[in-house]
Amino acid sequence: LRLLDHRALVCSQPGLNCTVKNSTCLDDSWIHPRNLTPSSPKDLQIQLHFAHTQQGDLFPVAHIEWTLQTDASILYLEGAELSVLQLNTNERLCVRFEFLSKLRHHHRRWRFTFSHFVVDPDQEYEVTVHHLPKPIPDGDPNHQSKNFLVPDCEHARMKVTTPCMSSGSLWDPNITVETLEAHQLRVSFTLWNESTHYQILLTSFPHMENHSCFEHMHHIPAPRPEEFHQRSNVTLTLRNLKGCCRHQVQIQPFFSSCLNDCLRHSATVSCPEMPDTPEPIPDYMPLW
């Protein structure tokens, strides 16, 4: 988790002097509770936005937006803590809005936004906005949280972001797999425009089961420039095991931008359809 400095970290708006600060996610009001605390945020919204840096690189960011409730507690609102928690790693990053002037009611509801948290493809986050100071122990909670799922690199908008392109999202291998005679598979795919090697990982399974009955790895050396964007054809020999008929072919590239961690593409060959066994015809007719 990190912040993108594609624009100045600003939280001031007409009628409010405010500054954005790094936060340890442990506000002082946890340790020194206050008697009077503000109410919770209202209408917290999280959206996927896209930000180009000064150099033009494109990153997905979480656009966080919320409003204030129209009660007297805004007189005691000193700021807000924004927290983003990546659910699969438990990594958390926080920033603090510090109000340098007192809020007053005005003709429009107060609204705040922040679009600087860079999010990763195919990750889920919990976004929390805590109004400050935080409540006393057993006080009513004054935060709002929402979960936010970021699409993966297959998503059209995500595909062209820098993190997705770095993992090889623009490569479409268009894999085809056909079963040949004599227990063989022919795998064909389109090479990318980089002199890098590939690996074909074959895993075979019985008809209706998920434990593998055969595994094989095939190395494809780096293509020459004249072979870029051409089809590569590989014939793989299968183990002659009856019923080991469902094959998953996975192609792993080793592009310089992602090395061992590039997006893999796969194709599956199903077991051949078994013809329905016809009912046996009795060779005599019962007379009763």
Epitope: H6, R7, Q47, L48, H49, F50, A51, H52, T53, Q54, Q55, G56, D57, V61, H63, S115, R157, M165
Partner: nanobody, 126 residues
């Protein structure tokens, strides 16, 4: 100070072509990503295309213009270009060139732009 001056707009029939230019000054042009945004009558600012700074500049396009518009830059001339082909009536808008960072939502509605020029009008009509 940063100056961005667009030119090349005009009236064109559907299916026609135009080439927009943007002359930049007041900053190190080659060090910045550059963008084209547009604003149709009565609508908000819409992101169109961005080109990276640096060698082998990466280009990005909104879905609605992909395959029809081409962004390019000439760092020696401090100029940004946008070639508009197969124009449609819905491409009618004021086109602006923008410098540096920009932020937009999933529908390409611009939320923030660092700096943009005065714009050049493109009208597609029969």
């Amino acid at each position: 100070q940063v100056q961005l001056q667009e030119s090349g707009g005009g009236l064109v029939q559907p299916g026609g072509s135009l080439k927009l230019s943007c002359a930049a000054s007041g900053f190190t042009f080659s060090s910045y990503g550059m963008t084209w945004v547009r604003q149709a009558p009565g609508k908000g600012l819409e992101w169109v295309s961005t080109i990276n700074s640096g060698v082998g500049s990466t280009t990005y396009y909104a879905d609605s213009v992909k395959g029809r518009f081409t962004i390019s830059r000439d760092n020696a001339k401090n100029t940004l270009y946008l070639q508009l082909n197969s124009l449609k009536t819905e491409d009618t808008a004021m086109y602006y060139c923008a410098k540096g960072s920009i932020e937009y939502d999933s529908d390409y509605r611009v939320n923030y732009v660092e700096a943009k020029g005065q714009g050049t009008q493109v009208t597609v009509s029969s």
